[in-house]
């Protein structure tokens, strides 16, 4: 019998975001999956570990801000993070925050994995071009 | 054919930190890697999952504090987290914060993995001696 | 020789929490472990990767709140996260926060994995019924 099939991806966010659905640099590490239009597309069925981490930068005004990070499978929200910043209502210098989210999920062939962020303008692609990432690896294949 | 080679580490931070480059207790769990001078040194080439989590304790004064956590490969900044605490500028009791960072990276033999924290004096080794950790495991070996 | 044994779990928190020891929905994904009374019980010895992520919602009053997340092995605290919210002391709208914690640990047969949260009333099971999870997978089996 052969060892488990291996599939993985490690993608960094695009420098210029203009949508709540994040897009990713295609020159990232990718093996056994396909990247297309903001989606990672599964080629081998199995149990996948999915993890996303984003760095945010918010210029606080006089109200708090809720930062979100959502993992979607086949365009359906499967897991989300919500963190409030600027809670004091003090107009201050830049506030940095970091959100992460993981998922262990069984995926069929052609399933899509994507990430949504409500306030995408706060994702810090300037200071941290390498630090906003979506990563996936196949834990257990089903064939 | 044989199953994948396994390499892993789970190290807890040294009790007494005195440098921005963190040092780790050598009595941690380690298999297929070597620990030396704050570095984990790779013995088998392959795709590694690296994750670090640190617990911070800050006594807020009248200004905000930026906490950092950086993963370095061969001493190069590969991934970093930055989180602002004490944002309200209120002198208050202790503020606890937790930062984590992960990386999926292909590493050659003798590659080094290390962690840098600019304000290392805030890493809470007293309350949480077991909770500041660097962990690594080989996902896919290349031989 | 055969490929590594696979064991995993991905459980979502119960809708109605009434204890510092969290309980989990039994209809989650579980393979090679048993769930009973808030515990995941190991069936195969080996090195396990354990990760828990919880979403909190706090209505700030005039004092700060320390949120905790503790991973326990055989009812013993092995790793914990502590994060302070409502630090400004401003009575405000809802504050969202997200905590995560991981552990790489060697477990024997019948070892138990559980999660404890001091202020369990702040775990947000209403807004985020799917987003409070405990996940485990066997990295390397010892037989």
């Amino acid at each position: 019998s052969t060892p488990s099939k291996k599939s993985w991806a490690y993608l960094q966010v695009s420098k210029h975001l203009n949508n709540t659905k994040l897009s990713w640099n295609e020159d990232g590490t990718i093996h056994g999956l396909i990247y297309q239009d903001g989606n990672l597309i599964v080629q081998f069925p199995g149990l996948y570990f999915i993890v996303c981490q984003l760095q945010f930068l918010v210029q606080c005004s006089n109200h708090s801000v809720d930062l979100t990070l959502q993992l979607l499978i086949n365009s359906k929200i499967k897991k989300q993070t919500l963190v409030t910043v600027c809670e004091s209502g003090v107009q201050s210098k830049n506030i940095y925050q970091n959100l992460s989210q993981f998922l262990l999920h069984y995926l069929q062939v052609n399933s899509t994995i994507s990430v949504r962020v409500d306030n995408f303008q706060y994702v810090d692609t300037n200071t941290f071009p390498l630090d906003n990432v979506l990563s996936v690896f196949l834990y257990s294949s089903s064939d | 054919s044989t199953p994948s080679k396994k390499s892993w580490a789970y190290l807890q931070v040294s009790k007494h930190l005195n440098n921005t480059k963190l040092s780790w207790n050598e009595d941690g769990t380690i298999h297929g890697l070597i620990y030396q001078d704050g570095n984990l040194i790779v013995q088998f080439p392959g795709l590694y999952f690296i994750v670090c989590q640190l617990q911070f304790l800050v006594q807020c004064s009248n200004h905000s504090v930026d906490l950092t956590l950086q993963l370095l490969i061969n001493s190069k900044i590969k991934k970093q987290t930055l989180v602002t605490v004490c944002e309200s500028g209120v002198q208050s009791k202790n503020i606890y914060q937790n930062l984590s960072q992960f990386l999926l990276h292909y590493l050659q033999v003798n590659s080094t993995i290390s962690v840098r924290v600019d304000n290392f004096q805030y890493v809470d080794t007293n309350t949480f001696p077991l909770d500041n950790v660097l962990s690594v495991f080989l996902y896919s070996s290349s031989d | 020789s055969t490929p590594s044994k696979k064991s995993w779990a991905y459980l979502q928190v119960s809708k109605h929490l009434n204890n510092t020891k969290l309980s989990w929905n039994e209809d989650g994904t579980i393979h090679g472990l048993i769930y009973q009374d808030g515990n995941l019980i190991v069936q195969f010895p080996g090195l396990y990767f354990i990760v828990c992520q919880l979403q909190f919602l706090v209505q700030c009053s005039n004092h700060s709140v320390d949120l905790t997340l503790q991973l326990l092995i055989n009812s013993k605290i092995k790793k914990q996260t502590l994060v302070t919210v409502c630090e400004s002391g401003v009575q405000s709208k809802n504050i969202y926060q997200n905590l995560s914690q991981f552990l790489l640990h060697y477990l024997q047969v019948n070892s138990t994995i559980s999660v404890r949260v001091d202020n369990f009333q702040y775990v947000d099971t209403n807004t985020f019924p799917l987003d409070n999870v405990l996940s485990v997978f066997l990295y390397s089996s010892s037989d």
């Epitope: - | 440098n19 921005t20 001078d37 930026d66 190069k76 900044i77 840098r116 | -």
Partner: antibody
Framework: EVQLQQSGPELVKPGASVKISCKAS????????MNWVKQSHGKTLEWIGD????????TYNQKFKGKATLTVDKSSSTAYMELRSLTSEDSAVYYC????????????WGQGTLVTVSA | DILLTQSPAILSVSPGERVSFSCRAS??????IHWYQQRTNGSPRLLIK???ESISGIPSRFSGSGSGTDFTLSINSVESEDIADYYC?????????FGGGTKLEIK
């Protein structure tokens, strides 16, 4: 080839400020911290501080807090050090240095900038 | 801060001789010591890192040894181009510090 090109010598009056630059080339500027080191005439080397070129967060040797301010301009791969309230004690050669090991083994050095404080 | 003491202040040797520079730390620093050469009017140049690890492009006649508090930089056959000041630096404890230097002269 890695190069750190520093600005030219400065003659400044006591109490004034000076800002010296260090332009990096031959590597990705944001990959490594930039360090600054002081060498007084005929004396040893003293580490002033370092700066993360990604977000501009600086760490200072306590001795130089309030004296030196480190900044970066990512777009031009240039690091800066401003020295304020200058006295004769600040007369020295100042080096920028990029680390070999990401911390404090400095493989790459600028040619040095001589700052002379004199009335 | 960790104090690094270099001795002697001046070393005078003939070409072809072996020479050793000493660096002593005020407390144990493992092997986190680095050695530099600085020629007249030049910038420092990294010779050895972490006590004994060689640097590419540095002649093989340079070597380092020691751990804990006592460290040595050796040149096994001195050449005239080696006339310079030599500094040790510790990176075990923040802030990083340098020794006072040893001047190498040729007889």
């Amino acid at each position: 080839e890695v190069q750190l090109q520093q600005s030219g010598p400065e003659l400044v009056k006591p109490g004034a400020s000076v800002k010296i630059s260090c332009k990096a080339s031959g590597y990705t500027f944001t990959d490594y911290y930039m360090n600054w080191v002081k060498q007084s005439h005929g004396k040893t080397l003293e580490w002033i501080g370092d700066i993360n070129p990604n977000h501009g967060g600086a760490t200072y040797n306590q001795k130089f807090k309030g004296k030196a301010t480190l900044t970066v301009d990512k777009s031009s791969s240039t690091a800066y050090m401003e020295l304020r309230s200058l006295t004769s004690e600040d007369s020295a050669v100042y080096y920028c240095a990029s680390p070999y090991d990401g911390y404090y083994g400095f493989a790459y050095w600028g040619q040095g900038t001589l700052v002379t404080v004199s009335a | 801060d960790i104090l690094l003491t270099q001795s002697p202040a001046i070393l005078s040797v003939s070409p072809g001789e072996r020479v050793s520079f000493s660096c002593r730390a005020s407390q144990s620093i493992g092997t986190s010591i680095h050695w530099y050469q600085q020629r007249t009017n030049g910038s420092p140049r990294l010779l050895i890192k972490y006590g004994s690890e060689s640097i590419s492009g540095i002649p093989s006649r340079f070597s380092g040894s020691g751990s804990g508090t006592d460290f040595t930089l050796s040149i096994n056959s001195v050449e005239s181009e080696d006339i310079a000041d030599y500094y040790c630096q510790q990176s075990n404890s923040w802030p990083t510090t340098f020794g006072g230097g040893t001047k190498l002269e040729i007889k």
